[in-house]
């Protein structure tokens, strides 16, 4: 083993703890190749009739079973160093010429092959008896993620040879694997915060800090759970993690006290009809607790009326509600409130909204229909219905007249202005029944139709006096 300081910034050859090939001449220069692939070969060597990785002379497969075992030389077992330092280590092996088919050395960490961007160099030292191979591995500015067990692998004569592990331990300040998290809590209600930090070096001790003051006098071994009995106001918590290398402070987290929401803002009337108002709003601050539902309060805005408040409950989203079953042509005061688990917000400032005028609620009365045969017209008369103020201003009438005879059906309608209470329509079909219904119209819409009044239209010149009808629903009067 060793200590971090001992191995930091150490030269490559100082790390060769296995025996170097003593048979190499002093002036012999090894062949070197950056090692980025497990099968990289050394360059061809002059004076040899075979590549360095292939043993010579050739031997039979039976003979290979009798070859002496080949193993990696022993090397450093444990390297301890601080974060951000550089580290270099190696493994080496001597391959006699009697071996055939050797592959390059590959580096592995914690059971997984290291491919790609790792910095490794393989050096070959050939001589008459065989080849010595040294695989060098370096890591610049080590991080915690470089911690682990490194080893070399090589295939010799189809047999896998594995080196002893080199355990790299990167030490540094404590590293948080679980930091306290912001939570929203009910006033005076207990809650827990968790803090966990690791080395190496271990142990890691935890101090809790609330609003810049330490909570615990004695440190707790990581992981630590702090139980806070309850708060009355927002606080900031953090934890300090200490080990032999120093201290690390976690992020500070806000612990918010749940309160009632702020009232909704921007209450707007999006649309009004005779009997409904569509209202929208922007929710206020939620008080650190999700809004559960909202309440729309509605009351008649007439200062002299003593109408009670109507309350409509709706979900917190969408921020929209259609208030229904309202009176036509009326003013209403509207306010919105929303609630979370703590309670209801104040109501928004009251706003005023108006419904539009409605359609008439009653049909024209006393409908009579006369046939003016000489002019070939129907003369229709009625009485204006009693229209309430909220029904709006009368703008006219709609007359529906349906003509039926054998094999013929004709449905027509006319609109007439409100001036007067009579109308004339031309006869459409003879030898037929005509059914007349009338509805009043205001800006708010069309009202209900009157009960049908039927009149029989005879064939041409069969009568010389005017038939008439009276509003007896469903009856046919002909004269």
């Amino acid at each position: 083993g060793g200590t971090a300081e001992k191995w930091e910034e150490t030269e490559l050859d100082q790390l060769f703890s296995g025996p170097l090939p003593g048979r190499l001449p002093v002036n012999h220069r090894p062949f070197s190749a950056p090692h980025s692939s497990r099968d990289q070969l050394p360059p061809p060597q002059t004076g040899r009739s075979h590549p360095a990785h292939t043993a010579a002379p050739q031997v039979t497969s039976t003979a290979s079973k009798l070859l002496p075992p080949v193993a990696f030389n022993h090397t450093i077992g444990h390297i301890v160093l601080s974060e951000h330092k550089n580290v270099k280590f190696n493994c080496s092996i001597n391959i006699p010429n009697t071996y055939q088919e050797t592959a390059g050395i590959s580096w592995w960490k914690d059971g997984k092959e290291l491919l790609g961007a790792h910095h490794s160099i393989t050096q070959f030292y050939p001589d008459e008896e065989g080849v010595s191979i040294i695989a060098l591995f370096s890591i610049a500015s080590v991080q915690r993620s470089d911690n682990g067990s490194y080893f070399c692998k090589m295939k010799v004569n189809n047999r896998e040879i594995v080196s002893d592990p080199i355990y790299v331990e990167v030490q540094g300040l404590p590293y948080f694997i679980k930091q306290p998290e912001s939570v929203n809590v009910t006033r005076n209600t207990a809650f827990n915060l968790t803090c966990q930090a690791v080395g190496p070096p271990e142990p890691v001790n935890i101090f809790w800090v609330q609003n810049s003051s330490r909570v615990n006098e004695k440190p707790e071994r990581s992981p630590s759970v702090l139980t806070v009995p309850g708060l009355t106001e927002t606080a900031v918590f953090s934890c300090e993690a200490h080990n032999d290398k120093g201290l690390t402070v976690s992020k500070g987290v806000h612990i918010n006290i749940k309160v009632i929401p702020s009232p909704p803002t921007e209450v707007h009337i999006l649309n009004s009809t005779a009997h409904s108002i569509l209202v929208s709003w922007v929710p206020g601050f939620d008080g650190y607790s999700p809004l559960q539902n909202c309440s729309i309060q509605v009351k008649e805005a007439d200062r002299l009326s003593n109408g009670s408040v109507m309350v409509f409950n709706t979900s917190a989203s969408p921020h929209l509600y259609e208030i229904q079953q309202l009176q036509a042509l009326a003013n209403y005061s509207i306010a919105v409130s929303c609630r979370n688990e703590i309670g209801w917000s104040a109501v928004s400032p009251w706003i005023l909204a108006s419904t539009t005028e409605g359609a008439p609620s009653v049909a024209p009365l006393n409908i009579t229909v006369f046939l003016n045969e000489s002019n070939n017209i129907l003369d229709i008369r009625w009485t204006k219905p009693p229209i309430k103020r909220q029904d709006g201003e009368l703008v006219g009438y709609r007359i529906s007249h349906v003509w039926e005879s054998a094999g013929t059906y004709k449905e027509l309608s006319e609109e007439v202005s409100q001036n007067g209470s009579w109308a004339q329509i031309p006869v459409q079909i003879h030898n037929a029944t005509c059914t007349v219904r009338i509805a009043a119209i205001t800006k708010g819409g069309i009202g209900p139709f009157s009960e049908p009044v039927n009149i029989i239209i005879p064939e041409h010149s069969k009568v010389d006096y005017a038939p008439s009808s009276t509003p007896a629903p469903g009856n046919t009067d002909s004269m």
């Epitope: 009632i260 104040a346 400032p349 009251w350």
Partner: antibody, heavy 116, light 111 residues
């Protein structure tokens, strides 16, 4: 007729608290907010906040958060405002007013004097 | 907060003449066709009395010589003809959003 009846004047010591009642009559108490307004001597009017008796929701002007607490007792149609940690700055007439668009009905006011 | 700037601070008007008091809002107090500005009259030792609500609506029981109008974010209270009993301090107030605020007041004197 809508009436809001407030209590008489209060003389309190600095640091103490006071609770001012406002009894409503002549209308359905829960149908209207109860707003509270402060008027220091010779000064303008300051809106303190309001409470909706229907749901108990309260809102306060930032200046009066922590100073005033509004509550209601629906059974007696009475609204209350508690003022705490009183200082000479809190010496004023305090009014309750029935909330709507425009305060059409006001209490007669309660004079709170803070003096050692 | 919406700031209401009231002017003038004091005003002296002859009996029978017109008194005009202005109130300017720092931003709009109107929405959905209504302006949430109100006018009050206050006499010494009494609570304020609502005169005009929603910028131009005369409160029940208030004499018709009081009227209110709006132009953008400028609101005006007119009293014409002024009577002796109109000597008082007048305040504007909005209820468009929280917090509600009042103007600083205009003291009207009659000569």
């Amino acid at each position: 007729e809508v009436q809001l009846q407030q209590s008489g004047p209060e003389l309190v010591k600095p640091g103490a608290s006071v609770r001012i009642p406002c009894k409503a009559s002549g209308y359905t108490f829960s149908d209207y907010n109860m707003d509270w307004v402060k008027q220091s001597h010779g000064k303008s009017l300051e809106w303190i906040g309001n409470i909706n008796p229907n749901i108990g929701g309260t809102i306060y002007s930032q200046k009066f958060k922590g100073k005033a607490t509004l509550t209601v007792d629906k059974s007696s149609s009475t609204a209350y405002m508690e003022l705490r940690s009183l200082t000479s700055e809190d010496t004023a007439v305090y009014y309750c007013a029935r909330g709507d668009y425009g305060f059409a009905s006001w209490g007669q006011g309660t004079l709170v004097t803070v003096s050692a | 907060d919406i700031v209401l700037t009231q002017s003038p601070a004091s005003l002296t008007v002859s009996l029978g003449q017109r008194a005009t008091i202005s109130c300017r809002a720092s931003r709009s107090v109107s929405t959905s066709g209504y302006s949430y500005m109100h006018w009050y009259q206050q006499k010494p030792g009494q609570p304020p009395k609502l005169l005009i609500y929603l910028a131009s609506n005369l409160e029940s029981g208030v004499p018709a010589r009081f009227s209110g109008s709006r132009s953008g974010t400028d609101f005006t209270l007119n009293i014409h003809p002024v009577e002796e009993e109109d000597a008082a301090t007048y305040y504007c107030q909005h209820s468009r959003e929280y917090p509600f605020t009042f103007g600083s007041g205009t003291k009207l004197e009659i000569k």
